[in-house]
Amino acid sequence: HNTTVFQGVAGQSLQVSCPYDSMKHWGRRKAWCRQLGEKGPCQRVVSTHNLWLLSFLRRWNGSTAITDDTLGGTLTITLRNLQPHDAGLYQCQSLHGSEADTLRKVLVEVLADPLDHRDAGDLWFPGESESFEDAHVEHSISRSLLEGEIPFPPTS
């Protein structure tokens, strides 16, 4: 699995999307987990409703929410009030009994709020030991662009 990078601004919300084949994963609950180290386990943060039919209902664990469009095949995770410690490697998972299939590997990067004039050194990225040369960047900054600002260029 390649790693997809989602960037969000500290203090704001970040929405992560994980597309999947809806028929392949029919009937399977989904989960969002945080990777503990490069080869460590993936610690469950939040999972969809216990009843698969109700997967569209948003479930929260602290500031993290999950909802699943089981027909369209898109799992959406919302990280509210993004904080420096939220930066890191995560996975979207499809659950089947005790099995967990990885739908997408996600690297969350937390950017300093440009409107926040605190210490300019407050940029939060995962440790340099992690290599994501093939990572695909999804810019998911949730605030509206200010007049005159240039939005991030689209990525392929």
Epitope: M23, K24, W26, G27, R28, W52, G97, E99
Partner: antibody, heavy 122, light 107 residues
Framework: QVQLQQSGAELARPGASVKLSCKAS????????IQWVKQRPGQGLEWIGT????????RYTQKFKGKATLTADKSSSTTYMQLNSLASEDSAVYYC???????????????WGQGTSVTVSS | DIQMTQSPASLSVSVGETVTITCRAS??????LAWYQQKQGRSPQLLVY???NLADGVPSRFSGSGSGTQYSLKINSLQSEDFGYYYC?????????FGGGTKVEIK
């Protein structure tokens, strides 16, 4: 109507390989997992593995890892199971079956092929 | 892997009697269970899915019940065409193992 048509009986020598086929019709081939099941004479059903033709993702029970290889050809809506290093205990009827789904998200094998008999003999 | 223990292995019954076959899973399978009937020399046929739901065309004398680790298939007023083999199968993660089967024969 949904149909799974399996290939004809096989007679093989010990140590040889055979490739069984299961041709699907009457539904969207790439959207349903296909299961393979073994049944030795006078014995019960034994689950071998499953493949999702949409992307070729295959899962096997531990016993059949290395023994069975599942593949799928989208262009012909056909799933294949190759059995290698054949031995007498591989003599059995092999079934393919579609993994049906329900609106509530449950699975069951709703359509079965007629079975292919494999006899391993020197 | 989840083990499915099916009982009895065989039973002899008369037409019109009621039969109950049970299946025990080695862990909770959350009703992800199917029952099949197989006649000699034929492919299995789906009877029950999701533990309690009858497949299309299955007579109402068949019924499935259970939850957690314990499941059963009941056949009321057994008919001559009901004789054969019955298997349970779980779908709570691969491998989708079967029970050992139950042979229902005429007394």
């Amino acid at each position: 109507q949904v149909q799974l048509q399996q290939s004809g009986a096989e007679l093989a020598r010990p140590g040889a390989s055979v490739k069984l086929s299961c041709k699907a019709s009457g539904y969207t081939f790439t959207s349903y997992w296909i299961q393979w099941v073994k049944q030795r004479p006078g014995q019960g059903l034994e689950w071998i593995g499953t493949i999702y033709p949409g992307d070729g993702d295959a899962r096997y029970t531990q016993k059949f890892k290395g023994k069975a290889t599942l593949t799928a050809d989208k262009s012909s809506s056909t799933t294949y199971m190759q059995l290698n290093s054949l031995a007498s205990e591989d003599s059995a009827v092999y079934y393919c079956a579609r993994n049906g789904i329900t609106t509530a998200g449950y699975y069951a094998m709703d359509y079965w092929g007629q079975g292919t008999s494999v006899t391993v003999s020197s | 892997d989840i083990q499915m223990t099916q009982s009895p292995a065989s039973l002899s019954v008369s037409v019109g009697e009621t039969v109950t076959i049970t299946c025990r899973a080695s862990e909770n399978i959350y009703s992800n269970l199917a029952w099949y009937q197989q006649k000699q020399g034929r492919s299995p046929q789906l009877l029950v899915y999701a533990a309690t739901n009858l497949a299309d065309g299955v007579p109402s004398r068949f019924s499935g019940s259970g939850s957690g680790t314990q499941y059963s298939l009941k056949i009321n007023s057994l008919q001559s065409e009901d004789f054969g083999y019955y298997y349970c199968q779980h779908f709570w993660g691969t491998p989708y193992t079967f029970g050992g089967g139950t042979k229902v024969e005429i007394k």
